[in-house]
């Protein structure tokens, strides 16, 4: 994601609400931010290959197979 | 409407160990963390720590690392803290926390009150 | 650890402004703190009203607005009402929440 999301996601959450049927095929990177201090929430924040920026629910069924390779991934290098 | 729903009170002998629960309601579970926190002499409040059900990731203020366990079932939506090897120092109301878009805080438990007493 | 420090009591009347302060004993209260405000009634009966410093949670009458006072957090109540007596918590972030040791505020009718 772009560095909007990141820089304010220091002091708050960043998701007021989510966008719903979004093809992966149109992200281009993806933040998932856990919860921490400032937001006790899990956000996923999509930029996607038009520019924009949305926020994503993390429960969406792709998202959480996205998410668990990558935890799988970095758990097979450790 | 958000709900979190805590067990009984309990009474425990100095040594022992006794497992808390916050069952919550009215939202997605896994997608908050929730905090844990006492208050003790019905007054000062501490931050035990948090659990992150999403990443299945803890956080403990270091003081309760060796003394509190927090965890999850997710298929009932529910939280968990053990606190073990129980002191009369121990004894306080115990408190799951929920926050929300604006605050870490937002929405308490109706409290635990444990009691250690031989 | 650092310590969170809160005026024990403050009194005031229906409609006045009072304000609450947090202090940290390592220096500033800044936004990375992340200054939480808290309220206790009879019961245990707890509610969240500010975090991040000034973003008030849901349901949180408009009266109640959080901010930075100088060196220290604060939380201001403008126009008081008789059911806003309660007792006041704020929670630091240092590597962990700590919090203050609250402020009882009464509201004399």
């Known amino acids: 994601a772009g560095p909007a999301a990141a820089v304010l996601r220091e002091l708050r959450c960043v998701c007021l609400q989510t966008t719903q049927g979004v093809h992966p095929k149109m992200i281009s990177n993806l933040q998932v931010f856990a919860i921490g201090p400032q937001c006790s929430k899990v956000e996923v924040v999509a930029s996607l290959k038009n520019g924009k920026e949305i926020c994503l629910d993390p429960e969406a069924p792709f998202l959480k197979k996205v998410i668990q390779k990558i935890l799988d991934g970095g758990n097979k290098e450790n | 409407e958000v709900q979190l729903q805590q067990s009984g009170p309990e009474l425990e002998k100095p040594g022992a160990s006794v497992k808390i629960s916050c069952k919550a309601s009215?939202?997605?579970?896994?997608?908050?963390?929730m905090n844990w926190v006492r208050q003790s002499n019905g007054k000062s409040l501490e931050w035990i720590g948090n659990?992150?059900?999403?990443?299945?990731?803890?956080s403990y203020n270091q003081k309760f690392q060796d003394k509190a366990t927090l965890t999850v079932d997710k298929s009932s939506s529910t939280a968990y803290m053990q606190l073990k090897n129980l002191t009369s120092e121990d004894s306080a109301v115990y408190f799951c926390?929920?926050?929300?878009?604006?605050?870490?805080?937002?929405?308490w438990g109706q409290g635990t009150l444990v009691t250690v007493s031989a | 650890q650092a310590v969170v420090t809160q005026e024990s009591a403050l009194t005031t009347s229906p409609g006045e402004t009072v304000t609450l302060t947090c202090r940290s004993s390592t220096g500033a209260v800044t936004t990375s703190n992340y200054a939480n405000w808290v309220q206790e009634k009879p019961d245990h009966l707890f509610t969240g009203l500010i975090g991040?410093?000034?973003n008030r949670a849901p349901g949180v009458p408009a009266r109640f607005s959080g901010s930075l006072i100088g060196d220290k957090a604060a939380l201001t109540i403008t126009g008081a009402q008789t059911e806003d007596e309660a007792i006041y918590f704020c929670a630091l972030w240092y590597s962990n929440h700590v919090f203050g040791g609250g402020t009882k505020l009464t509201v004399l009718q």
């Open positions: 659990f992150d059900p999403y990443f299945s990731v803890t």
């Open positions: 009215g939202y997605s579970f896994t997608v908050y963390g």
């Open positions: 991040g410093t000034n």
């Open positions: 926390a929920r926050g929300s878009w604006e605050t870490i805080f937002a929405y």
